[in-house]
């Protein structure tokens, strides 16, 4: 019995279905086919879980979190024992193993390994201002998404006809911050932060209004 090489790793956007491949060759009839799919979750590497089991001509559910979401892609028994996972969740990220036995065919490689990574677009970022908005002050515009796999980058732009930040601004595209030094009336306006990764973008807006000193009455 010989399980074929798998593609190594599969990536899928959260909520989309994933197909984890596993095929094998055997010299025996598929009467005593036994297939166990296991996962070592990334979030809990020392706690392997059963995903689905085929034994004695019957299918059995694995861990409760997979119930109703997992199945074999084809009619069993077969030499293609690939599975699908519907509505993928972040917690599905991990290393999946298919263990195949088909007595009396023993020997050879009976395990296939495939990594699954569930990707998440950036969640709606939170925009905020740190620091005094008085003229001449330094302010920091902050932007961060709670979710996003792979790690998002953040791009701040001023929503005027140039889309350019003030010349005194420096931005950190990973942290999502923009520092604007010595703010002036020209710094006022609407700023947009765009959080993006390979599978999505999300935005938030922030209105910066620089406060000019009030003229003082003399008398």
């Amino acid at each position: 019995l010989e399980v074929s090489e798998s593609p190594g790793s599969i990536q899928v956007a959260r909520g989309q279905p994933a197909v984890l491949p596993c095929t094998f060759t055997t010299s025996a009839a598929l009467i005593n086919l036994n297939v166990i799919w296991m996962v070592t979750p990334l979030s809990n590497a020392n706690q392997p879980e059963q995903v689905i089991l085929y034994q004695g001509g019957q299918m059995f559910d694995g861990a409760p979190r997979f119930h109703g979401r997992v199945g074999f892609t084809g009619t069993m028994p077969a030499t293609n024992v690939s599975i699908f996972i519907n509505n993928t969740q972040l917690s599905d990220t991990g290393t999946y193993q298919c263990l195949v036995n088909n007595l009396p065919d023993i020997g050879g490689r009976n395990i296939g390994v495939t990594g699954l990574t569930v990707l998440v677009p950036p969640s709606a970022p939170h925009c905020q201002i740190q620091g005094s908005q008085d003229i001449g002050s330094d302010v920091i515009l902050l932007c961060s998404s709670e979710e996003g796999i792979p790690r998002p980058t953040y791009l701040w732009e001023k929503l005027d006809n140039t889309l350019k930040l003030p010349p005194t601004a420096t931005q950190d595209q990973v942290q999502g911050t923009v520092t604007i030094r010595n703010i002036s009336a020209l710094s006022s306006g609407l700023y947009q932060c765009v959080a993006s990764n390979a599978i999505g973008t999300s935005t938030c807006l922030l209105d910066l209004q620089v406060i000019s000193p009030q003229p003082r009455n003399i008398g």
């Epitope: 593609p7 190594g8 790793s9 599969i10 990536q11 899928v12 956007a13 990574t117 990707l119 792979p150 790690r151 998002p152 980058t153 791009l155 420096t170 931005q171 950190d172 595209q173 990973v174 942290q175 993006s196 990764n197 390979a198 599978i199 999505g200 973008t201």
Partner: antibody
Framework: QVQLVQSGAEVKKPGASVKVSCKAS????????ISWVRQAPGQGLEWMGW????????NYAQKLQGRVTMTTDTSTSTAYMELRSLRSDDTAVYYC??????????????WGQGTLVTVSS | DIVMTQSPSTLSASVGDRVTITCRAS??????LAWYQQKPGKAPKLLIY???SLESGVPSRFSGSGSGTEFTLTISSLQPDDFATYYC?????????FGQGTKVEIK
């Protein structure tokens, strides 16, 4: 098994355009972005821009804005970079590179073999 | 654009030597720095990201440190396979920019 295979060398005249392809295999193409990086002979590396293979979003280096277009064809898992109005200083090896699987579009964990584009009259 | 300056431009060393390459940024880039190795006629290979995180499959003799504007790549014991050109790359602000490279050659 991740592989990025680029198209062959090109010789172009000043003012012409070039389109370089980058065929990906061994991973889910639409789950990553592709950056393009070029290297002039004997020089350092220059980032040109990025495209998401998932939704086609792009981010180009300001210096090349208006001359460069990056596209993808998800049916063939191929990324393309077109550079127009070529000048002699565009002579370089052009690389495609995949987003890093953890930190995303900021660094590149797999690279194509490079495509030499020579601009000469 | 953020300018990345590497030093030295060329470094002569012997197998077994401890080698240090420095990269300076023209403004603070937090820890958003990567190091690549490139051999003649080949594509660059990622060694380090986030200033100090070792890329999967890269030998542990490579290490990175630093934050803000000053960063170092250290090869604890230079091996024959390590003779190459090394580049730093910042990803704090677009456009991502690279250093001019440091060539490590055999003494």
């Amino acid at each position: 098994q991740v592989q990025l295979v680029q198209s062959g060398a090109e010789v172009k005249k000043p003012g012409a355009s070039v389109k370089v392809s980058c065929k990906a295999s061994g991973y889910t193409f639409t789950s990553y972005g592709i950056s393009w990086v070029r290297q002039a002979p004997g020089q350092g590396l220059e980032w040109m821009g990025w495209i998401s293979a998932y939704n086609g979003n792009t981010n180009y280096a300001q210096k090349l804005q208006g001359r460069v277009t990056m596209t993808t064809d998800t049916s063939t898992s191929t990324a393309y970079m077109e550079l127009r109005s070529l000048r002699s200083d565009d002579t370089a090896v052009y690389y495609c590179a995949r987003d890093h699987s953890i930190v995303g579009a900021t660094t590149f964990d797999y690279w194509g073999q490079g495509t030499l584009v020579t601009v000469s009259s | 654009d953020i300018v990345m300056t590497q030093s030295p431009s060329t470094l002569s060393a012997s197998v077994g030597d401890r080698v240090t390459i420095t990269c300076r940024a023209s403004q603070s880039i937090s820890s958003w720095l990567a190091w690549y190795q490139q051999k003649p006629g080949k594509a660059p290979k990622l060694l380090i990201y986030d200033a100090s995180s070792l890329e999967s499959g890269v030998p542990s003799r490579f290490s990175g440190s630093g934050s803000g504007t000053e960063f170092t790549l250290t090869i604890s014991s230079l091996q024959p396979d390590d003779f190459a050109t090394y580049y730093c790359q910042q990803y704090n602000s677009y456009p991502w920019t690279f250093g001019q490279g440091t060539k490590v050659e055999i003494k």
